[in-house]
């Protein structure tokens, strides 16, 4: 006996109670592929979640986080509290970065400032809680007799750098 369910398109389900007739998904449910025997319940964006895309008969709802939170996990499965730049989230809430570390985002952890001298560079601008150090020229470039000429043009142009 031919399986009539394979003819049921997305947005419908194969209703065994009605001789394998394709029935539309009920409200607040969806089927994203054809041939489904059931429709899936739509995700509800509640609490710290807000709706980014409404559920339709063929696709699930998509959630974002409300202001002050950011998404974590696949398909924004969790919301985590934002902190300010210069802070990181701990079990006790947002804490300022320790001296010598920075965080330039509202999420993530504080990272150590770059150690310019390890890379053979001098410090141009000191780091802050919100920003990494900017390294400057190498000490060799600063010695007497060093050329002040700009280095030769790079092989390819760099990408955009934050300002």
């Amino acid at each position: 006996l031919q399986d009539l369910c394979s003819n049921c398109p997305a947005g419908t389900f194969c209703d065994n109670n009605r001789s394998q007739i394709c029935s539309p998904c009920p409200p607040n449910s969806f089927s994203s592929a054809g041939g489904q025997r059931t429709c899936d319940i739509c995700r509800q964006c509640k609490g710290v979640f807000k709706t980014r895309k409404e559920c339709s008969s063929t696709s699930n709802a998509e959630c974002d986080c409300i202001s002050g939170y950011h998404c974590l996990g696949a398909e924004c499965s969790m919301c985590e509290q934002d902190c300010k730049q210069g802070q990181e989230l701990t079990k006790k809430g947002c804490k300022d970065c320790c001296f010598g570390t920075f965080n330039d985002q509202k999420r993530g952890i504080c990272r150590p400032w770059t150690n310019c001298s390890l890379d053979g560079k001098s410090v141009l601008v000191n780091g802050t809680k919100e920003r990494d150090v900017v390294c400057g020229p190498s000490p060799a470039d600063l010695s007497p007799g060093a050329s002040s000429a700009t280095p030769p043009a790079p092989a390819r142009e760099p990408g955009h750098s934050p300002q």
């Epitope: 141009l124 920003r131 900017v134 280095p151 955009h160 750098s161």
Partner: nanobody
Framework: QVQLVESGGGVVQPGRSLRLSCAAS????????MGWYRQAPGKQRELVAS????????NYADSVKGRFTISRDNSKNTMYLQMNSLKPEDTAVYYC??????????????????WGQGTQVTVSS
């Protein structure tokens, strides 16, 4: 590429003021910080003052704190060094410097340091 051109140097008496300018052109969008270095004859080039182009945060060498002020006008792609109460020991060639990227290295390992050609400042009575 970034091009830097300094101007405003000259001969001035002790206690007087000068303002240096550094005009940047080319890929100025990539500059995250700029600075003024100076080099007296036979001496190492030293950092005088530096500035973050985005938020305007500044650093100064101890020897110029309270006398020199670094600033920038992003709309004109120009950095300035206002030098007040000049002393004979401020005599040097002053160089403009620009850096593209935080830390020491940049995207895909590119690193870029840019220098101007320098402008002479002589403080003498």
């Amino acid at each position: 590429q970034v091009q830097l051109v300094e101007s405003g140097g000259g001969v001035v008496q002790p206690g007087r003021s000068l303002r240096l300018s550094c005009a940047a052109s080319g890929s100025t969008f990539s500059i995250v910080a700029m600075g003024w270095y100076r080099q007296a004859p036979g001496k190492q080039r030293e950092l005088v003052a530096s500035i973050i182009t985005g938020d305007g945060d500044t650093n100064y060498a101890d020897s110029v704190k309270g006398r020199f002020t670094i600033s920038r006008d992003n709309s004109k792609n120009t950095m300035y060094l206002q030098m007040n109460s000049l002393k004979p020991e401020d005599t040097a060639v002053y160089y403009c410097y620009a850096r593209t990227g935080y830390g020491s290295s940049w995207l895909m390992g590119h690193e870029y340091d840019y220098w101007g050609q320098g402008t002479q400042v002589t403080v003498s009575s």
